[in-house]
Amino acid sequence: KGEQISFRDCAEVFKSGHTTNGVYTLTLPNSTEEVKAYCDMEAGGGGWTIIQRREDGSVDFQRTWKEYKVGFGNPSGEYWLGNEFVSQLTNQQRYVLKIHLKDWEGNEAYSLYEHFYLSSEELNYRIHLKGLTGTAGKISSISQPGNDFSTKDADNDKCICKCSQMLTGGWWFDACGPSNLNGMYYPQRQNTNKFNGIKWYYWKGSGYSLKGTTMMIRPAGF
């Protein structure tokens, strides 16, 4: 019986010869825990591990700390891969983060960070980002320096309010900050003047709720 091959991310899947978009099973080294992730094998050379996707409002993103920790949703559709997996993965080697955005007028934009990692759960999965390029704003819509992750049951933001309860969704809220890609999904023609929507301030402003978002990571040397 042949040895079971395991992949830590979609870059390894790609390099093994699997170059078709789809859901793959990933396992961290020295771990038996498996996660199912969508791999984008076409965009920008492929090998992208999708860690978040919004596209139609089919999944509720107002979830608990534990749910954001382990992940939820459908990897073929809307989902969150899981903070614990992403934290462990991004602390093993250097990763880039690409955030792809779609508005309701048919426009697309992206933000690319040349270095991305999440701190451990003990440090509230704080986000760390460096080196922004892209078309979705010259200023980072994820506050810098990075903030701790907050959910409806874990208020780690810098506001005298509770950002996650008010804006909905788990995110690296400041007070409350220029973005929230896990906010309430609003359909077309109901997506403006919505402070609790899917926001990327330095592309579309404060009250605009986006049509679609994808957060994807890949090793820096890929």
Partner: antibody, heavy 122, light 112 residues
């Protein structure tokens, strides 16, 4: 610690001008919309003016429109209210106030300055 | 402009007893995003106002849990479960759903 320190109040004759200042510290001033709210002696609160984080959006109460000008200098972390053609009914304590939430989300006033008294009298 | 009407205007309360303040608006404050842009502020004697409740029912950090806000549309209530001496001052409701923002006339809470 968030602080809003006001200055510039005083006694002024009707028809004259006065400029109020509000120096901000302890937060990223350029990310927040700011307001002026006033309170006539022994009376309630009245909103006066708003300026967005970048200064691109400005609103005034009808009672001061055309006479008062709100402005900000994000490099100096400062908010201003230029008051011209002052009237006796403008006599009040003027407060600067910061939006609760950043990036121009209007959900109330999370922090207030200490207030400065403007007295318009001949 | 939206008219905000508070009652009572004066509220004498015995320490340890509950208190309730009503705020009514001349139009609905329910925004299309499902939130009521209704805040409550307390102005203690000789001090600047301070935020107590935002978006109708959300307590600001540092505000004791004896304070609670409720209501939707045009009728809102601020409740203090057990009044303490430090709660004296003037309470204001303020709406931000419709421009310009407008305040209620204030309710003066005093200790009996």
């Amino acid at each position: 610690e968030v602080q809003l320190v006001q200055s510039g109040g005083g006694v002024v004759q009707p028809g004259r001008s006065l400029r109020l200042s509000c120096a901000a510290s302890g937060f990223t001033f350029s990310s927040y919309g700011m307001h002026w709210v006033r309170q006539a002696p022994g009376k309630g609160l009245e909103w006066v003016s708003y300026i967005s984080s970048s200064g691109s959006t400005i609103y005034y109460a009808d009672s001061v429109k055309g006479r008062f000008t709100i402005s900000r200098d994000n490099a100096k972390n400062s908010l201003y209210l230029q008051m011209n053609s002052l009237r006796a009914e403008d006599t009040a304590v003027y407060y600067c106030a910061r939006d609760l939430l950043d990036y121009d989300i209007l959900t109330g006033y999370g922090y207030w300055g200490q207030g400065t008294l403007v007295t318009v009298s001949s | 402009d939206i008219v905000m009407t508070q009652s009572p205007l004066s509220l004498p309360v015995t320490p340890g007893e509950p208190a309730s303040i009503s705020c009514r608006s001349s139009q609905s404050l329910l925004h299309s995003n499902g939130y009521n842009y209704l805040d409550w502020y307390l102005q203690k004697p000789g001090q600047s106002p301070q935020l107590l409740i935002y978006l109708g029912s959300n307590r600001a950090s540092g505000v004791p849990d004896r304070f609670s806000g409720s209501g939707s549309g045009t009728d809102f209530t601020l409740k203090i479960s057990r009044v303490e001496a430090e709660d004296v001052g003037v309470y204001y409701c303020m709406q931000g759903t419709h421009w310009p923002p407008t305040f209620g006339q204030g309710t003066k809470l005093e200790i009996k």
